[in-house]
């Protein structure tokens, strides 16, 4: 799990002739807001398909009124980032659509009117956890400058947010098949992804794909308090007699999408899939013509001279989609061998090879351990096109150069003191406890430094010790 973050830096006239008219005027003051839509980049989806990775809407920007006779400047922007949370793995390659919307603040009947000013789209490769990436996109005579990044939400780490770093389950080592998390040698890397949507507060998992509930919570995603789990109706008003917590109407109830658009629920709200010729949050924007510059990436717009006739975008080589907003994915043929990463640079394909492989298509297998030294008595282990060091006791990291602190994971229970030792660690137990890690109270119902059974707990109840 993690968050995709988008920072809009500027929106204004692009370079070159034909500066656009200001979208606002003294008669019609307006303000801008932005919408971002994300889709997994390797899926061959139409431009109108739902935002499978998520979508977000910015706040409204400051009100702007054009100064008479002045060229359209960069327009005032909303504050803050646009954040799109994603629940599962970050796909690495993604498609985006960023829409700039104008909200007119005149005296129209029925409140403010919205209209789409510009729409840019693209496809990018991005690793989670990396630095901000800067971008410039043009739509007609407008230019949008922005930065974006993807970051993982703890405890997820890695370029796809699929690795989890958790405190060690066992005191002295990671479980079978689990490695220490570099550089956090006191934590274990677990290839553990709980069921999508599993409550981070009330659920946990010990095996991938499961969602186990902490005491007092139930339901498939551990989101229902135990006292409220006897509800039968899937949706409807709350029942005073049963105390059921029942969700209210769904975001798609009554279909908020206009002009024949179809509605699909998203984790945060809803998404409208619009028929051709309609756009906007609720498919309320119509009458797009070639004058609006709807074809991206150098596409040629044909037809659509008046709002009642559809336009067609003739796309240049390498692009497709009804608005030429999608780059043709030549990487879908998987030309890179041995797990190499395919990069479509537009003018050429490039393969980024995994460690241990080389060649234009990563076709050459190298000796993984050749020239690789493991420090501090570690031994090199070949396999899977990457070398790995099996480190001597007390050392960790990729090349065994990091000294592991055996006490960092608080391996001594019940207030025991941990001491690093040349052979590992030693626990000095608090009075009344024993065991290699002080995990066993000697007399659990007697007086001891930390009582093992606080009053009111029955056998079988969990008790917490720090």
């Amino acid at each position: 799990a993690g968050v995709f973050e988008l920072q809009i830096h500027s929106f204004g006239p692009g370079p070159g002739p034909g500066a656009p008219r200001s979208p606002c005027s003294a008669r019609l003051p307006c303000r801008l807001f932005f919408r971002v839509c994300l889709k997994p980049g390797l899926s061959e989806e139409a431009a109108e398909s739902p935002c499978a990775l998520g979508a977000a809407l910015s706040a409204r920007g400051p009100v702007y009124t054009e100064q008479p006779g002045a060229p359209a400047p960069d327009l005032p922007l909303p504050d803050g980032l646009l954040q799109v949370p994603f629940r599962d793995a970050w796909p690495g390659t993604f498609s985006f659509i960023i829409e700039t919307w104008r909200e007119e603040l005149g005296d129209q009947i029925g409140g403010p009117a919205w209209s789409l000013l510009a729409r840019v789209a693209g496809r990018r490769r991005l690793a989670a956890g990396g630095p901000w990436a800067r971008d410039i996109q043009r739509a007609g005579a407008w230019e949008l400058r922005f930065s974006y990044r993807a970051r993982c939400e703890p405890p997820a780490v890695g370029t796809a947010c699929t690795r989890l770093c958790r405190p060690r389950s066992a005191p002295s080592r990671c479980g079978p098949g689990l490695r220490p998390c570099a550089p956090l040698e006191d934590e274990c890397e677990a290839p553990l992804v709980c069921r999508a949507g599993c409550s981070p507060e009330h659920g946990f998992c010990e095996q991938p794909g499961e969602c186990r509930c902490l005491e007092g919570w139930t339901g498939p995603l551990c989101t229902v308090p135990v006292s409220t789990s006897s509800c039968l109706s899937p949706r409807g008003p709350s029942s005073a007699t049963t105390g059921c917590l029942v969700p209210g109407p769904g975001p798609c109830d009554g279909n908020p999408c206009a002009n024949g658009g179809s509605c699909s629920e998203t984790p945060r709200s809803f998404e409208c899939t619009c028929p051709r010729g309609f756009y906007g949050l609720r498919c309320e924007v119509s009458g797009v013509t070639c004058a609006d510059g709807p074809c991206f990436n150098g596409g040629l717009c044909v037809g659509g001279a008046d709002p009642d006739s559809a336009y067609i975008c003739h796309c240049p080589p390498g692009f497709q989609g009804s608005n030429c907003e999608k780059r043709v994915d030549r990487c879908s043929l998987q030309p890179c061998r041995n797990g190499g990463l395919c990069l479509d640079l537009g003018h050429a394909l490039r393969c980024r090879c995994r460690a241990g492989f080389a060649g234009p298509r990563c076709e050459h297998d190298l000796d993984d351990c050749a020239g690789r030294a493991c420090a501090n008595g570690g031994t090199c282990v070949e396999g899977g096109g990457a070398h790995r060091c099996s480190c001597a006791l007390g050392f960790g990291g990729r090349d065994c150069r990091e000294r592991a602190d055996p006490c960092a994971a608080r391996p001594c229970a019940h207030g025991g003191r941990c001491y690093a030792h040349f052979s590992g660690l030693v626990c000095a137990c608090a009075p009344g406890y024993m065991g290699a890690r002080c995990e066993f109270p000697v007399h659990p119902d007697g007086a001891s430094a930390l009582p093992a059974a606080p009053p009111g707990l029955r056998p079988g109840d969990p008790q917490r010790y720090l």
């Epitope: 060690r168 969990p462 010790y465 720090l466």
Partner: nanobody, 117 residues
Framework: EVQLVESGGGLVQPGGSLTLSCAAS????????MAWYRQAPGKKRELVAG???????MYIDSVKGRFTISRDNAKNSVYLQMNSLRAEDTAVYYC???????????WGQGTLVTVSS
């Protein structure tokens, strides 16, 4: 939540043998430190034997050489093999678990062992 269910208790003559079982659910026993405790009538509950998450074992002096604690990861269970039983071993035997991920302790409901001729 970890749940522990003991079984195997009963009546046995002095010098006899008995094996207690503790079946765990809600977590893998390989990730738990587990122990057997006993409580004789009118006495405090006391630790008998323990097995840490890393597999190391420990015993109180009065049972060393007679009792053996073991773990079967496949069956998600912990056992206490009791040989050369004595009358003073008569007690309710409880299974105990310490879960390292949450630092919570759990108890079973107990099983009665009576050593009598």
């Amino acid at each position: 939540e970890v749940q522990l269910v003991e079984s195997g208790g009963g009546l046995v003559q002095p010098g006899g043998s008995l094996t207690l079982s503790c079946a765990a659910s809600g977590s893998r026993v390989s990730f738990l430190s587990m122990a057997w405790y006993r409580q004789a009538p009118g006495k405090k509950r006391e630790l008998v034997a323990g097995i840490s998450a890393d597999g190391s074992t420990m015993y109180i002096d009065s049972v060393k050489g007679r009792f053996t604690i073991s773990r079967d990861n496949a069956k998600n269970s912990v056992y206490l093999q009791m040989n050369s039983l004595r009358a003073e071993d008569t007690a309710v035997y409880y299974c105990y678990a310490y879960r390292w991920t949450t630092r919570l302790t759990y108890w079973g409901q107990g099983t009665l062992v009576t050593v009598s001729s």
